[in-house]
Interface confidence: low
């Protein structure tokens, strides 16, 4: 808490400029008008304030806006955003994608902080759903963002947003999340032709049911082993040897290297030895 002291003569700030970096903390508190600061927030980032000085500026804004900052101020917070607590951010009403981008830019290159997680949560809740533009923005800054959402949260993603998802955005998704995303992807890509469809749907197949895998096996897709290993065990188990052979195409030889790992291990144990022998890979059921 900074003590209230009178501003020394001639030191009253007329605008936010570089001269303020020479002010002591108490001078900033006494000589900078909070309303002036709010209207000239965009200048703060161009001035090399110390963290202690930024604390004073934040304190002034907190006094001016006890119920939470208006978006006109939030959009220009810049590095002052790093000083905000999740509790501060919960008071905000952020509706502009430009504001969101500006604040994510400040945190770029760092892991998602509790502040950023709170900001995103406020923004998404304000919009009511994860629309394509928002998802585009969030996954650009945080490729793992989608996989940090619960299955319940993912259910608010409209199928149209799935076009914004890149394979690397799904790297850390678990099967329950893919169970939610897969039907949306199937709907989003339904009008594509066979080979193009497979390229797009491939990353989501960890949520695919058996019948969809059977259908894919009829389309010469040549699924790679990395994708096959991420399929749901319960979806793979009912597939016949012939279906798996068609599904994997030339990659079927890779089953040998994965024979002790799920889902290959469990699938092998469900097959008749005669059928396995037709693959010529020496797999033992």
């Amino acid at each position: 808490e900074v003590e209230k002291t009178a501003c020394p003569s001639g030191k009253k700030a007329r605008e936010i400029d570089e001269s303020l970096i020479f002010y002591k903390k108490w001078e900033l508190e006494a000589c900078v008008d909070a309303a002036l600061l709010a209207t000239q927030m965009d200048r703060v980032n161009a001035i090399p304030f110390t963290y202690e000085q930024l604390d004073v500026l934040k304190h002034k804004l907190d006094e001016l806006y006890p119920q939470g900052y208006p978006e006109s101020v939030i959009q220009h917070l810049g590095y002052l955003f790093l000083k905000m607590s999740p509790e501060d951010i919960r008071k905000w009403n952020v509706t502009s994608l430009e504001t969101l981008k500006a604040l994510l830019e400040v945190n770029k290159g760092h892991e998602m902080s509790p502040q950023v997680a709170t900001l995103i949560d406020r923004f998404v809740k304000g919009r009511g759903q994860l629309d394509k533009d928002t998802l585009d923005t969030l996954t650009a800054f945080y490729p793992g963002y989608l996989c940090s959402l619960s299955p319940e949260e993912l259910s608010s993603v409209p199928p149209s947003s799935i076009w914004a998802v890149r394979p690397q955005d799904l790297d850390t998704c678990d099967p329950r999340q893919l169970d939610v995303l897969y039907p949306k992807a199937r709907l989003a890509f339904q009008n594509m032709n066979g080979s193009e469809y497979f390229v797009k749907i491939q990353s989501f197949l960890g949520g695919a049911p058996t019948e969809d895998l059977k259908a894919l096996s009829q389309q010469n897709v040549s699924m790679d082993l990395a994708t096959f290993m991420k399929l749901r065990t319960d979806a793979v188990l009912p597939l016949t040897v012939a279906e798996v052979q068609k599904l994997l195409g030339p990659h079927v030889e890779g089953l040998k290297a994965e024979e002790r790992h799920r889902p290959v291990r469990d699938w092998i144990l469900r097959q008749r030895q005669d059928d396995l022998d037709t693959l010529g890979l020496g797999l033992q059921g």
Epitope: E111, M112, A117, G144, C147, S148, D171, T172, C173, D174, P175, R176, G206, K230, R232, T233, H261, R262
Partner: nanobody
């Protein structure tokens, strides 16, 4: 309700050893949670990943600060993961939490936001 139960924490002199164990109440890899391992949190610090194992495959991950001193292993039949901690240092003092999550590769373990199940934690104190 899935539970992770830790044991093996305690107090030890610098240079000493401890073995932590974490047992899951069921085989979590059935649900796709194929990584198990340990995070730790010292007072006033962020929770950080220590070590992890890709269950079933045995691929491991270690934080740089523990490489060569800590070893993670598993007993699939018991749904248990062990952390053997040797050459302990005072900076290893922390609450150690067992965690389970899905990993595309075991190095993904480090992101604590994506952890699906946490243990209650076991305290490790190393005095000089």
């Amino acid at each position: 309700q899935v539970q992770l139960v830790e044991s093996g924490g305690g107090s030890v002199q610098a240079g000493g050893s401890l073995r932590l164990s974490c047992t899951a109440s069921e085989d979590l890899s059935i649900y796709g949670y194929n990584c198990m391992g340990w995070f730790r949190q010292a007072p006033g610090k962020e929770r950080e990943a220590v070590a992890a194992i890709y269950t079933g495959r045995g691929t491991t991950y270690y934080a740089d600060s523990v490489k060569g001193r800590f070893t993670i292993s598993q007993d699939n039949a018991k749904n248990t993961v062990y952390l053997q901690m040797n050459s302990l240092k005072p900076e290893d003092t922390a609450m150690y939490y067992c965690a389970s999550k899905y990993c595309a590769v075991v190095a993904d373990f480090g992101n604590s936001r994506l952890v699906r199940y946490w243990g209650q934690g076991t305290q490790v104190t190393v005095s000089s």
